[in-house]
């Protein structure tokens, strides 16, 4: 049969609220060298126990009896500390355990999860969470909105999760946890009601350097919208936007619109350029979320200036004209040049030169027409830019370079058909 247990004092019981500090103690009397005392909780050796061991000899000789006291300190009682505690010693080839002591937790409910502050769009459903535990169990929850209970009694309404179908004003929520020991109240969460995301962002009109856009505002609860903010960003390098990144790859152009109307003219844009735009609207509570980026493009414009450095020289029945691209912005893709020449008493001749910047003209007759002048204009798909001032044809002087070009015969009668959006020049010779 087993030897008698050396334990003369066993751990007591501790029951208290979270945070309590307490000590468990066991005492044994042994003969010879005192053993190390280990502590068990629910059968598991406590490897990092905050324990102290005191040994007192009862006689002069080492082989006499010793009193050994081990104390286990529980510094701040938590649920994980609860269970059955025993002391364990190894004496010779035998193992001894003390009678058990019990550590229990009992107090006001303890929150594992509390409602968090958040922002929600007006009239949009959302959930809040609250979770509490004892012991003692059960723990019943009662939700409050703006300090008003949402159920007749604890445990009767929603418990861990509160579903709110939507709010039209900023509100506060908290939950009460009730158990046999009393009531604990959670933190109060503020739910801020922001405007809904605007809808239907679209283009109203386009100009080469400006876009007019409009949108439909979302609901904003009891808080009127104060303004809307529109952002535009060049999308040449806007790969991030296409990939749905939340922020543009470069500093956006930001404009504010008073509302109503929910419309804004965005100026100072580059012509014939792709942009991405988005809008958010703000109330006294804060801004809505941004709309998705909308790809838009400014249309082409006509060149803003005439071709430069026009030179026109005449040699008998031929005239050589050359020029350079306009210095002013083209506002689009240059499609070519138009040239007009006119004598003092002859009708004006209009020609489409294409993208060449020089032309040799075959003049009618013997070249005796007097006071010949030439004008040149650049054009894009949007139409003609301004015509240059008339340049008189100077007589060719020997020594001047005269490049050889394919001759352009003057038609017997100028018959040009212009698209309706191309405007005719109105220069006077």
């Amino acid at each position: 049969q087993a030897e008698e247990s050396p334990f003369v004092g066993n751990p007591g019981n501790i029951t208290g609220a979270r945070g309590l500090t307490g000590t468990l103690r066991c005492q044994l009397q042994v003969q010879g060298e005192p053993p190390e005392v280990h502590w068990l909780r629910d059968g598991q050796i406590l490897e990092l126990a905050d324990s102290t061991q005191t040994q007192v000899p009862l006689g002069e000789d080492e082989q006499d009896d010793w009193i050994v006291v081990s104390q286990l300190r529980i510094t701040s009682l938590q649920l994980s500390d609860t269970g059955q505690y025993q002391c364990l010693v190894f004496l010779g080839h035998q193992t001894f355990v003390s009678q058990p002591g019990y550590v229990g937790l009992e107090g006001l409910p303890y929150f594992l999860e509390e409602p968090e502050d958040r922002t929600v769009a007006a009239n949009t459903p959302f959930n809040l969470s609250c979770q509490a535990q004892g012991p003692p169990e059960p723990v019943d929850l009662l939700w409050l909105q703006d300090a008003v209970p949402l159920a007749t009694a604890p445990g009767h309404g929603p418990q861990r999760s509160l579903h709110v179908p939507g709010l039209n004003k900023t509100s506060s929520f908290s939950c009460e946890a009730h158990n046999a020991k009393g009531v604990t109240t959670s933190r109060t969460a503020t739910i801020t009601v922001l405007p809904q995301q605007p809808r239907n962002l679209h283009l109203v009109s386009r100009q080469p350097t400006e876009l007019e856009v409009a949108w439909t505002p979302g609901l904003s609860g009891i808080y009127p919208l104060t303004h809307c903010t529109l952002q535009a960003v060049l999308s040449d390098d806007g790969m991030g936007i296409q990939a749905g990144e939340p922020d543009p790859p470069e500093e956006p152009l930001t404009s504010q619109a008073s509302v109503p109307p929910h419309q804004l003219r965005l100026g100072s844009l580059h012509p014939h350029t792709p942009y991405h735009i988005r809008v958010a609207c703000t109330s006294s509570q804060g801004p809505s979320s941004w709309t998705h980026w909308l790809p838009v493009e400014t249309p082409e414009g006509v060149p803003l200036g005439p071709p430069e450095n026009i030179s026109a020289t005449r040699n008998g029945s031929q005239a050589f004209v050359h020029w350079q691209e306009p210095r002013a912005p083209l506002q689009g893709t240059l499609l070519g040049y138009r040239l007009a020449y006119q004598g003092q008493d002859t009708p004006e001749v209009l020609m489409d030169i294409g993208l060449r910047q020089e032309v040799t003209l075959e003049l009618q007759g013997d070249g005796s027409v007097s006071n010949l002048t030439v004008c040149v204009a650049a054009y894009t798909a949007a139409g003609d830019g301004p015509w240059s001032l008339p340049v008189p044809l100077e007589a060719w002087r020997p020594g001047q370079a005269q490049p050889v070009h394919q001759l352009v015969k003057e038609p017997s009668t100028p018959a040009f058909s212009w698209p309706h959006h191309h405007h005719h020049h109105h220069h006077h010779h």
């Epitope: 068990l40 598991q44 050796i45 990092l48 059955q84």
Partner: antibody, heavy 116, light 106 residues
Framework: QVQLVQSGAEVKKPGASVKVSCKAS????????INWVRQAPGQGLEWMGW????????KYNEKFKGRVTMTRDTSISTAYMELSRLRSDDTAVYYC?????????WGQGTLVTVSS | EIVLTQSPATLSLSPGERATLSCSAS?????MYWYQQKPGQAPRLLIY???NLASGIPARFSGSGSGTDFTLTISSLEPEDFAVYYC?????????FGQGTKLEIK
């Protein structure tokens, strides 16, 4: 000396239950935890849970919760392990073992075969 | 749960040789325990609290290690030592065992 003696081998059909006993002697039965550990053929060891005979408190491995029940009869120093809804993969040797933070004494094992 | 990995899976040695068995834990633990199991028998405790020899176990068995790496050493193998050896932890629940190292005669 400490001894743990288990009941004999069992053959069960899938869906049935089995109850294995473990009789302790040579030490104060109510002071030490009795654990149950199983070993499938050619496999390693798997802890199933414990019972503290002094109070009847139990702790089960999550894997077996809902299927295992551990009880004891202190008057005859015997612990029991019942496993229900048996499946073919429950075929194993079931050991009881005394524990003091580890398993210092073991029963001889009980072979439970689950076969249709 | 803490996973214990034993190496090697099989160790082939001759009587009189020194055997070194390793056990690695997936996270740090305080104590390791070692068991010996022979065919048709229950496991038997060899080492407790990492380095303490259990009752009736010959002194040629020793245990060491800390943190995640632990070792069982048999200084000079006897014929009766050829068996399967398991390491075990109970630093966290549930207690778990290694998959075993089979020590066989070369």
């Amino acid at each position: 000396q400490v001894q743990l003696v288990q009941s004999g081998a069992e053959v069960k059909k899938p869906g049935a239950s089995v109850k294995v006993s473990c009789k302790a002697s040579g030490y104060p039965f109510t002071d030490f935890y009795i654990n149950w550990v199983r070993q499938a053929p050619g496999q390693g060891l798997e802890w199933m849970g414990w019972i503290y005979p002094g109070s009847g408190n139990t702790k089960y491995n999550e894997k077996f919760k809902g299927r295992v029940t551990m009880t004891r009869d202190t008057s005859i120093s015997t612990a029991y392990m019942e496993l229900s809804r048996l499946r073919s993969d429950d075929t194993a040797v079931y050991y009881c073992a005394r524990s003091t933070g580890f398993f210092d004494y073991w029963g001889q094992g009980t072979l439970v075969t689950v076969s249709s | 749960e803490i996973v214990l990995t034993q190496s090697p899976a099989t160790l082939s040695l001759s009587p009189g040789e020194r055997a070194t068995l390793s056990c690695s834990a997936s996270s740090s633990i305080g104590y390791m325990y070692w068991y010996q199991q022979k065919p048709g028998q229950a496991p038997r405790l060899l080492i407790y609290l990492t380095s303490n020899l259990a009752s009736g176990i010959p002194a040629r068995f020793s245990g060491s290690g800390s943190g995640t790496d632990f070792t069982l050493t048999i200084s000079s193998l006897e014929p009766e030592d050829f068996a399967v050896y398991y390491c075990q932890q109970w630093s966290s629940n549930p207690p778990t065992f290694g998959q075993g190292t089979k020590l066989e005669i070369k």
